[in-house]
């Protein structure tokens, strides 16, 4: 059959913000298949960071970064 | 517990070489970006150089670029700084540390002295 | 890159006192300012995080506030293991990290 595409899940989240220069990007974590709906912060120091996308310094990063590069995330 | 163990310091002459290393251990060390930190005699902490968990990213103090070369092990859970070209205003307490992720430093090995005489 | 100006550079004080340090950024870092405690011959110890968070295992006499450039650290009641020397960080920018000059807290 097809190979599988592995699915990236989000098992604990930052309970810290992350300051907006350190970040690099982000990604939408909505499989079905994850126990939770996340965010994943890709610093600039190339670490993925889990958090919470209701949180408002979540939303708030994800603005920044989108007034930063203008491409659609997935 | 959380260690950073720190060895290589030394007396050296300007111009030559000397290696710093910083053996980590009680936490998951191949995580983790690190910090070179340094500090003068009598003066305050500079920033000296950062290096990404898994080593693709280094960034340099302005004052060390081209000179100083950060880099890790993570089989060996160890830190190194290579110092080339060293300069009498290079003489410090050399610290590891890490990077919390949001900025802040901890944990901090205990110092290695550095000094560059002739 | 953003400068850190500490104050006063020195003080001296008594077991019991409170007393108060401030850090004045170059420019607005909101509140990614952390603390740190020396003491002489030892590695600085992280004591608070985003201005205000306390890290785990530092007393609670310790405390830090302000955002934006002005920031405080408060001890509430001097101990005689808290004279050191203390320095602010500002945490906002990548990746140069900068520091205060220090302030050298002595026994009166």
């Known amino acids: 059959g097809p190979a599988s595409v592995p699915t990236t899940c989000c098992f604990n989240l930052a309970n810290r913000k992350i300051p907006l220069q350190r970040l690099e990007s982000y990604r939408r974590i909505t499989s079905g298949k994850c126990p939770q709906k996340a965010v994943i912060f890709k610093t600039k120091l190339a670490k993925d960071i889990c958090a919470d996308p209701k949180k408002k310094w979540v939303q708030d990063s994800m603005k920044y970064l989108d007034q930063k590069s203008p491409t659609p995330k997935p | 517990q959380v260690q950073l163990v720190q060895s290589g310091g030394g007396v050296v002459q300007p111009g030559r070489s000397l290696r710093l290393s910083c053996a980590a251990s009680?936490?998951?060390?191949?995580?983790?970006?690190m910090h070179w930190v340094r500090q003068a005699p009598g003066k305050g902490l500079e920033w000296v150089a950062v290096?990404?968990?898994?080593?693709?990213?280094?960034h340099y103090a302005d004052s060390v670029k081209g000179r100083f070369t950060i880099s890790r092990d993570n089989s060996k859970n160890t830190l190194y700084l290579q110092m080339n070209s060293l300069r009498t205003d290079d003489t410090a307490v050399y610290y590891c540390?890490?990077?919390?992720?949001?900025?802040?430093?901890?944990?901090w090995g205990q110092g290695t002295m550095v000094t560059v005489s002739s | 890159d953003i400068q850190m100006t500490q104050s006063p550079s020195s003080v001296s004080a008594s077991v019991g006192d409170r007393v108060t340090i401030t850090c004045r950024a170059s420019?607005?870092?909101?509140?990614?300012l952390a603390w740190y405690q020396q003491k002489p011959g030892k590695a600085p110890k992280l004591l608070i995080y985003?201005?205000?968070s306390l890290q785990s295992g530092v007393p609670s006499r310790f405390s830090g506030s302000g955002s934006g450039t002005d920031f405080t650290l408060t001890i509430s009641s001097l101990q005689p293991e808290d004279f050191a020397t203390y320095y602010c960080?500002?945490?906002?920018?990548?990746?140069?990290?900068?520091f205060g000059q220090g302030t050298r807290l002595e026994i009166k």
């Open positions: 009680g936490f998951t060390f191949s995580s983790y970006g």
């Open positions: 960080q500002q945490a906002s920018s990548f990746p140069s990290i900068t």
């Open positions: 540390a890490g990077d919390t992720d949001y900025g802040d430093i901890d944990p």
């Open positions: 420019q607005d870092i909101s509140s990614w």
């Open positions: 985003a201005a205000s």
């Open positions: 290096i990404s968990y898994d080593g693709s990213i280094k």
